[in-house]
Interface confidence: medium
């Protein structure tokens, strides 16, 4: 899967699927609150933390944002920092923890109806003030108000997995998130390691379905580390 090569402005701190630390690609990428270890579809954190350097919010975990560790610090040295809770100071949405957004410099609870308008303002494609070269498309990714009343089908824009129909999860796709199928037995899955590329996927896969976990495919044990294929397998 592709690293989240793209977005620097999109809202990232949204509640993860299944209540874990985003139990699918993008979750275990962060070094900031600790390493994330899979346990079924839940994740536990272990606090032998080392700061993870970053350039964009999307390179950090769901509960983090990318910034200089010290006020007025060298902008060239940025690390993933823990998100800010309700009523804490902020400068942008990504600084606030899941379920909150930045309003007038303070992290506040994201009432969905109000939040939708905020999304329309802030989930602009990362590169964007130039006019799109494409006809008939706004540069701004807007979310249909319908999505809060009907569950999104495969390919529908979403914010979180609860926006998607049964059997689907909300996963990143380029600069936005769409409903994608939860993985079935035998399908290729993404298992994050501490080493290597930490960025969130641009083409994110869902997590493995119930009763399945993401493990090295048996006939790939001998393969080199970089080419090991992980698939969803029965516990």
């Amino acid at each position: 899967t592709l690293n989240s090569v793209l977005n620097s402005n999109a809202i990232k701190n949204l509640p993860p699927p299944l209540g874990g630390a985003a139990g699918h690609p993008g979750s275990a990428v962060s070094a900031a609150p600790g390493i994330l270890y899979p346990g079924g579809n839940k994740y536990q954190t272990i606090d032998n933390y080392q700061p993870y350097p970053c350039a964009e919010d999307e390179e950090c975990g769901t509960d983090e944002y990318c910034a200089s560790p010290t006020r007025g610090g060298d902008a060239g040295v940025q690390i993933c920092l823990a998100c800010r809770k309700r009523r804490k100071r902020c400068m942008r949405h990504a600084m606030c923890c899941p379920g909150n957004y930045c309003k007038n410099g303070i992290c506040v609870s994201s009432d969905q109806n109000h939040f939708r308008g905020e999304i329309e303002e802030t989930i602009t494609e990362s590169f964007g003030n130039d006019h799109s070269t494409l006809d008939g498309y706004s540069r701004r990714t807007t979310l249909s108000s319908k999505m809060y009343h009907t569950k999104g089908q495969e390919g529908s824009v979403c914010l979180r997995s609860s926006d998607c129909a049964s059997g689907l999860c909300c996963a990143r796709h380029f600069w936005s998130k769409i409903c994608k199928p939860v993985l079935k037995e035998g399908q290729v899955c993404t298992k994050h390691r501490r080493k290597g590329s930490h960025g969130l996927e641009i083409f994110q896969r869902c997590y493995c379905g119930e009763g399945l976990s993401c493990r090295i495919q048996k006939d790939h044990h001998q393969a080199s580390n970089s080419s090991r294929l992980h698939t969803c397998q029965r516990h």
């Epitope: 690293n3 090569v5 970053c54 350039a55 964009e56 494609e125 003030n129 070269t133 960025g199």
Partner: antibody
């Protein structure tokens, strides 16, 4: 007018290295993700690598992972592809291409003219 | 990885003909599909994006349709400048191209 101009191609021996450049003009370079796409002689198109507008994040096709490195210098409006441990199968015309925003399919809306890389002993 | 299969791999047609090229994905890709035209020695050119949207400056004789796994590029009335190779490309999961369809003069 949007323009992308590749350079740096040439003949190199297997195992050798080469660095391709793509000079961009006519648009705000730092706001666009960019990719390298290649085409072996008489064959189809193959995507190679992508980089975000800020350069903060990159990704590679499995066929080049660990050997190629994409980077960009936004102050120079230039995209790069460092190619190491080159193989005969890397022989191709290499195009740099810009990703359009605005549609979920994020197509390649502008392409350079390409630069030929030949890997041969 | 998602495989993209184009058919036919080549076809012969005359000016004024209606030409249809199909592209099939090995799994669901929604409408995350683009079409390109490439002439010998030249870079590809974007024709259709997101399955059915005509790129600015592309003649209206080109159209795209389909969603899910099956897609079609149609040239309603083939012109001399349309003889080229056409590629589909998906961006639902990674970025992969079809093998191409060469449109030749009959």
């Amino acid at each position: 007018e949007v323009q992308l101009l590749e350079s740096g191609g040439g003949l190199v021996q297997p195992g050798g290295s080469l660095r391709l450049s793509c000079a961009a003009s006519g648009f705000t370079f730092s706001k666009y993700a960019m990719s390298w796409v290649r085409q072996a002689p008489g064959k189809g198109l193959e995507w190679v690598s992508i980089i975000s507008g800020s350069g903060g994040t990159t990704y590679y096709a499995d066929s080049v992972k660990g050997r190629f490195t994409i980077s960009r210098d936004n102050s120079k409006n230039t995209l790069y592809l460092q190619m190491n441990s080159l193989r005969a199968e890397d022989t191709a015309v290499y195009y740099c291409a810009r990703h359009a925003h605005g549609a979920g399919s994020y197509p390649f809306d502008y392409w350079g003219q390409g630069t030929l890389v030949t890997v041969s002993s | 990885d998602i495989q993209m299969t184009q058919s036919p791999s080549s076809l012969s047609a005359s000016v004024g003909d209606r030409v249809t090229i199909t592209c099939r994905a090995s799994q669901y890709i929604g409408t995350y599909l683009n079409w390109y035209q490439q002439k010998p020695g030249k870079a590809p050119k974007l024709l259709i994006y997101a399955a059915s949207n005509l790129q600015r400056g592309v003649p209206s004789r080109f159209s795209g349709s389909g969603s899910g796994t099956d897609f079609t590029l149609t040239i309603s009335s083939l012109q001399p400048e349309d003889f080229a190779t056409y590629y589909c490309q998906q961006s639902y999961s990674d970025l992969t191209f079809g093998g191409g369809t060469k449109v030749e003069i009959k």
